[in-house]
């Protein structure tokens, strides 16, 4: 039985040209996390593997930085980055847990952050 839950930064907004940290956290399970995938809709941004480290998709290599922790920093934001992002935790023996974050990239200087995690 899968008992874990994923907490995320929730719905967040950021300014065009700025950067944002996407973070998830898996809790309430003793399952071992073996890999975390970060995806935007159906597009893979990055993978963090427990044994192999980080792999950044070539199309995002110029504006994605790993961290903090298993999080992902997305830089040089454009309005096209608005949309859903998913953290997919591969665990043993539970299986897969998925968290969702909605990012809105704003033209204006009014941008509110989600407050579940500490985001610089």
């Amino acid at each position: 039985m899968m008992t874990g839950t994923i907490e995320t930064t929730g719905n967040i907004s950021a300014e065009k040209g700025g950067s944002i940290i996407l973070q998830c956290h898996l809790s309430s399970t003793t399952a071992q996390v073996t890999q975390v995938n970060w995806e935007q809709q159906d597009q893979l941004l990055a993978i963090c593997n427990a044994d192999l480290g980080w792999h950044i998709s070539p199309s995002f290599k110029d504006r994605v930085a790993p961290g903090p922790g298993l999080g992902l920093t997305l830089q040089s934001l454009t309005v096209n980055d608005t949309g859903e992002y998913f953290c997919i935790y591969h665990t043993y023996p539970d299986g897969t847990y998925t968290g969702r974050i909605f990012l809105e990239v704003l033209e204006s200087s009014v941008a509110e952050h989600g407050a579940r995690f500490q985001i610089p």
């Epitope: 980080w54 994605v64 930085a65």
Partner: antibody
Framework: QAYLQQSGAELVRSGASVKMSCKAS????????MHWVKQTPGQGLEWIGK????????DYNQRFRDKATLTADTSSSTAYMQISNLTSEDSAVYFC??????????WGQGTTLTVSS | DIVMTQSQKFMSTSIGDRVSVTCKAS??????VAWYQQRPGQSPKALIY???YRYSGVPDRFAGSGSGTDFTLTISNVQSEDLADYFC?????????FGGGTKLEIK
């Protein structure tokens, strides 16, 4: 097994700059964040910043943003930290450390920097 | 910045005893905390990640616990080789920050 070999001790005059190195082996250099940490008896362990050699992106502690510059040479699997405008407060042991799975899992042996006036 | 406070700078214990080193974060860091051991003259060594998971090769007498803002490293059946400084560190957000350290002394 990951291994980090840091350059030797440095004795440098105040006002000058120094560049120390951290040669990585035993893993894929471009797949892990490399962090730098300062240790002094008074301030303990302080995080300076990190670089992801896969694309060169850096994050700095605001305290060290005008003091330290992090770079990486993927051809030699070596990370570098340059410290500029040295003062006595920069005298410390500096560690490079590779971020593994949710911790700084591998550490170099440290480089001792002594700034003389 | 998130401040990690280790209120006890020194702790004295005897061989075979059980000792708990505590660390308090100034903000919620979930379980994004690691513990390190630094023996005299050596580099730090990672013991615990994600607050409670032991690194491979770390003896099972080392155990981590806690979440949110309060974290504990417990050493059971203390051995002479455990004489060292112990540091907590948060990796919830940049800049990563460390506790001031707790020096474990053997009576």
């Amino acid at each position: 097994q990951a291994y980090l070999q840091q350059s030797g001790a440095e004795l440098v005059r105040s006002g000058a700059s120094v560049k120390m190195s951290c040669k990585a082996s035993g893993y894929t250099f471009t797949s892990y964040n490399m962090h730098w940490v300062k240790q002094t008896p008074g301030q303990g362990l302080e995080w300076i910043g990190k670089i992801f050699p896969g694309n060169g992106f850096t994050d700095y502690n605001q305290r060290f943003r005008d003091k330290a510059t992090l770079t990486a040479d993927t051809s030699s699997s070596t990370a570098y930290m340059q410290i500029s405008n040295l003062t006595s407060e920069d005298s410390a042991v500096y560690f490079c450390t590779r971020e593994g799975w949710l911790s700084l899992g591998y550490w170099g042996q440290g480089t001792t920097l002594t700034v003389s006036s | 910045d998130i401040v990690m406070t280790q209120s006890q700078k020194f702790m004295s214990t005897s061989i075979g005893d059980r000792v708990s080193v505590t660390c308090k974060a100034s903000q919620n860091v979930v379980t994004n905390v690691a513990w390190y051991q630094q023996r005299p003259g050596q580099s730090p060594k990672a013991l615990i990640y994600s607050a409670s998971y032991r690194y491979s090769g770390v003896p099972d007498r080392f155990a981590g616990s806690g979440s949110g803002t309060d974290f504990t490293l417990t050493i059971s059946n203390v051995q002479s080789e455990d004489l060292a400084d112990y540091f907590c560190q948060q990796h919830n957000s940049y800049p990563y920050t460390f506790g001031g350290g707790t020096k474990l002394e053997i009576k």
